[in-house]
Amino acid sequence: GWVWNQFFVPEEMNTTSHHVGRLRSDLDNGNNSFQYKLLGAGAGSTFIIDERTGDIYAIEKLDREERSLYILRAQVIDITTGRAVEPESEFVIKVSDINDNEPKFLDEPYEAIVPEMSPEGTLVIQVTASDADDPSSGNNARLLYSLLQGQPYFSVEPTTGVIRISSKMDRELQDEYWVIIQAKDMIGQPGALSGTTSVLIKLSDVNDNKPIFKESLYRLTVSESAPTGTSIGTIMAYDNDIGENAEMDYSIEEDDSQTFDIITNHETQEGIVILKKKVNFEHQNHYGIRAKVKNHHVDEQLMKYHTEASTTFIKIQVEDVDEP
């Protein structure tokens, strides 16, 4: 019968011929009366055989990532009779892996959105690199992830590539971050190959800003001839949040005379001061009222950012009109 050993040839060998192994029949007594033959894909081109000894040689540089095994057929013939000594048999030459491929991130570009002020440990995104080397061959395809850029706001789990928040971020200070992740094979040991990827992380808005009046004092005038419902001026607060988190409502906080009202223009986010009761210059020629502003929608968890509403003082001068 055939005497089989496992046949391996390392990929990327630079030598002109590399001894792979030897075909042998247990009937071969070494008197050179047997002839060994190699058949199948790769025979004669990639692999050659010494017909007298059965030694197989690889004569081409091999790439395991292109082809990881070769299925060949072996024959042994008695030269004196021309007959097969053993039945033709199929055997395998495996191409053994070397660490010649760096990790690659195949799903680039990476982009993630996470709410600002998210707590430490919040999951942002998982990045995954793949390595074309053999995962079953040592550590050639065993990857470790690390953060090259993004501290102290982000961290990456070394074995999973999961990116998490490691420090609270405020969108109003910085609304996006570029994080650079490196994947190293050989679990980071010497001789490791590496690949990098960039992740754009955008912060979405939460309602962590209250509206605040830019001016602490407004001066308006109203004619004593103005009918009720007249708009006598506008006041404005600013909120650095965006979208519905910046929508606000104005109201009167103090108006002992109950002469004025404030309505909110939701298009412009301005407060419009309205005359609720007619005024008389001779009766009272100036008024002082206090207005306040609050967000329209405030999430319960974010109330700590909205403890006291901003107010402003409005001085209103009544203009005299000559009466007949």
Epitope: R171, E172, L173, Q174, I212, K214, S216, N240
Partner: antibody
């Protein structure tokens, strides 16, 4: 790294002028408003002026209004403070400081997150 | 013009909690920032928007703001916390600083 470096301080006589500079590096200068803040020897911090990221708005403390002018050159990553009609009470260490907050935010809620090392101005006859 | 008032000095034993106040008319309606300044050094922002921490500032520093008073609290005070502390707010497009408080950590 992110830094601001002031220069241009020195000794000057009352009534004369001086121009301070503040060179920025390590961040996108054109995205940030910048303040000047001063501190007289042994005294507290006093705000002087602020300029918005694009130069569109400038505000001054009453004590320097009409005498000091804040300006910036975004192509040179540099902030300036032109000080005219200097008085003895203007003697101080002058700091430039970055206004925290992205463009589009208003107000000074977020503080001044990067400060220079300061440059000393002495007004004396 | 708007004014912020701070006590000139506060003393605290190591490991204890230090509280520095800053008062101003309706200050709770505004947002307050706090700065630490050590001798010969530039100020450092330690709290902004009443109660938020800039990156790198330990959570021993905390802030609150209500009514007419904002408070900077330093828990587990260490010798390295000895410094001048300034509150800051803004009013009608201008920035206002408090007069500063010298924090002494008793040895």
């Amino acid at each position: 790294q992110v830094q601001l470096v002031e220069s241009g301080g020195g000794v000057v006589q009352p009534g004369r002028s001086l121009r301070l500079s503040c060179a920025a590096s390590g961040f996108t200068f054109s995205r940030y408003g910048i303040h000047w803040v001063r501190q007289a020897p042994g005294k507290g911090l006093e705000w002087v002026a602020v300029i918005w990221y694009d130069g569109s708005n400038k505000y001054y403390a009453d004590s320097v209004k009409g005498r000091f002018t804040i300006s910036r050159d975004n192509s040179k990553n540099t902030l300036y403070l032109q000080m005219n009609s200097l008085r003895a009470e203007d003697s101080a260490v002058y700091y430039c400081a970055r206004r925290a907050g992205i463009p589009g935010t208003t107000g000074y809620y977020y503080g001044m997150d990067v400060w220079g090392q300061g440059t000393t101005v002495t007004v004396s006859s | 013009s708007y004014e912020l008032t701070q006590p000139p000095s506060v003393s605290v034993s190591p490991g204890q909690t230090a509280s520095i106040t800053c008062s101003g008319d309706r200050l709770g309606e505004k947002y307050v920032s706090w700065y630490q300044q050590k001798p010969g050094q530039s100020p450092i922002l330690v709290i902004y928007q009443d109660n938020k921490w800039p990156s790198g500032i330990p959570e021993r520093f905390s802030g609150s703001n209500s009514g007419n008073t904002a408070t900077l609290t330093i828990s587990g005070t260490q010798a390295m916390d000895e410094a001048d502390y300034y509150c800051q707010a803004w009013d009608s497009s201008t920035v206002v600083f408090g007069g500063g408080t010298k924090l002494t950590v008793l040895s």
